[in-house]
């Protein structure tokens, strides 16, 4: 199946500029806006620090670390009350992402 210009392949995401068409389904993660074409049962999330389609159950249960949101070699921890997650780099620096 051929894709039209600007059309995303099923199950994929792309980072978009803030001024793009607001009618597209999107989710802001760590202030980064992405456009995703997720399959049934999937929703826009983050995998390896990039926008990705993830199992919708992960979002529903707020088990954010199951998305594998951090880079390889980093540790993932849920924030208190599952409001997001932290990625801990090998040297101990942490990056926190909150989900609104």
């Amino acid at each position: 199946q051929f894709l039209k210009e600007g059309q995303l392949a099923a199950g994929t995401c792309e980072v978009i500029a803030a001024h793009r068409d607001s009618s597209q389904p999107r989710r802001t993660i760590a202030r980064q806006t992405a456009r995703c074409a997720c399959r049934k049962g999937q929703i826009a999330g983050t995998t390896r620090a990039r926008p990705a389609c993830v199992d919708a159950r992960i979002i529903k249960t707020k088990q954010w670390c199951d998305m594998l949101p951090c880079l390889e070699g980093e540790g993932c921890d849920l924030l208190i009350n599952r409001s997001g997650w932290t990625c801990t780099q090998p040297g101990g620096r942490i990056k926190t992402t909150t989900v609104s």
Partner: antibody, heavy 114, light 113 residues
């Protein structure tokens, strides 16, 4: 509102030990790291060190030994400076260090003079 | 020793013009993209403009654009305004386990003609 405020800056003589305090509000130090940065009058920004929740602090190579960063409470991070010299005269900032440093405190001025 | 070299150290631009500031790291930043840009005006703390090399910070005008990866990065300011007069700094993040966690460039002073 996420906020940081530095305190403790003052005029001291060379050789003095001084402790600056960064007090945060609107976010938790258990979830975010904090960096200390200084700026000498008319000069650029100079990173001093970083601390994240329960991890050991990290320092710029030039700051190791004379500067100590510690989390002193759930809302405060201290910067202890020993054997101060006139070269340490600067405005000292603390900033939440996450995806870039944001927000920053207004800074506190340390003047070292005899 | 970690080093971030910013060029030029000062630049002048007319209102409506475009300015480009370069930042070169002596080694690759963490994840090849952990570089931020700041704007600082006299008597104020720095203000975050861009993080992760190209992501605009909240509330920052889209006239500011960041690009680059690895060791070479650029900040472009288009349609320059009088209010853009300030000093701009790049800041690289590095692995805390092998080097200094952070380093700043020397700064670029922007003067509006």
């Amino acid at each position: 509102q996420e906020q940081l405020v530095e305190s403790g800056g003052r005029l001291v003589t060379p050789g003095t030990t001084l402790t600056l305090t960064c007090t945060v509000s609107g976010f938790s130090l258990s979830s975010y790291g904090v960096s200390w940065v200084r700026q000498a009058p008319g000069k650029g920004l100079e990173w001093i060190g970083y601390i994240a929740n329960n991890y050991n602090p990290h320092y710029a190579s030039w700051a190791k030994g004379r500067f100590t960063i510690s989390k002193t409470s759930s809302t405060t991070v201290d910067l202890k400076m020993t054997s101060l010299t006139t070269e340490d005269t600067a405005t000292y900032f603390c900033a939440r260090d996450n995806y870039g440093m944001d927000p920053w405190g207004p800074g506190t001025l340390v003047t070292v003079s005899s | 020793e970690l080093d971030l070299t910013q060029t030029p150290s000062s630049v002048s631009a007319a209102v409506g013009g475009t300015v480009t500031i370069n930042c070169q790291a002596s080694q690759s930043v963490y994840n090849n993209k952990n570089l931020a840009w700041y704007q600082q005006k006299p008597g104020q703390p720095p203000k975050l403009l861009i993080y992760a090399a190209s992501t605009l910070a909240s509330g920052v005008s889209s006239r500011f654009k960041g690009s680059g990866s690895g060791t070479q990065f650029t900040l472009t300011i288009s349609d320059v305004q009088c209010d853009d007069a300030a000093t701009y700094y790049c800041q690289g993040e590095f692995s805390c386990s092998s080097a200094d966690c952070n380093a700043f460039g020397g700064g670029t002073e922007l003067e509006i003609l």
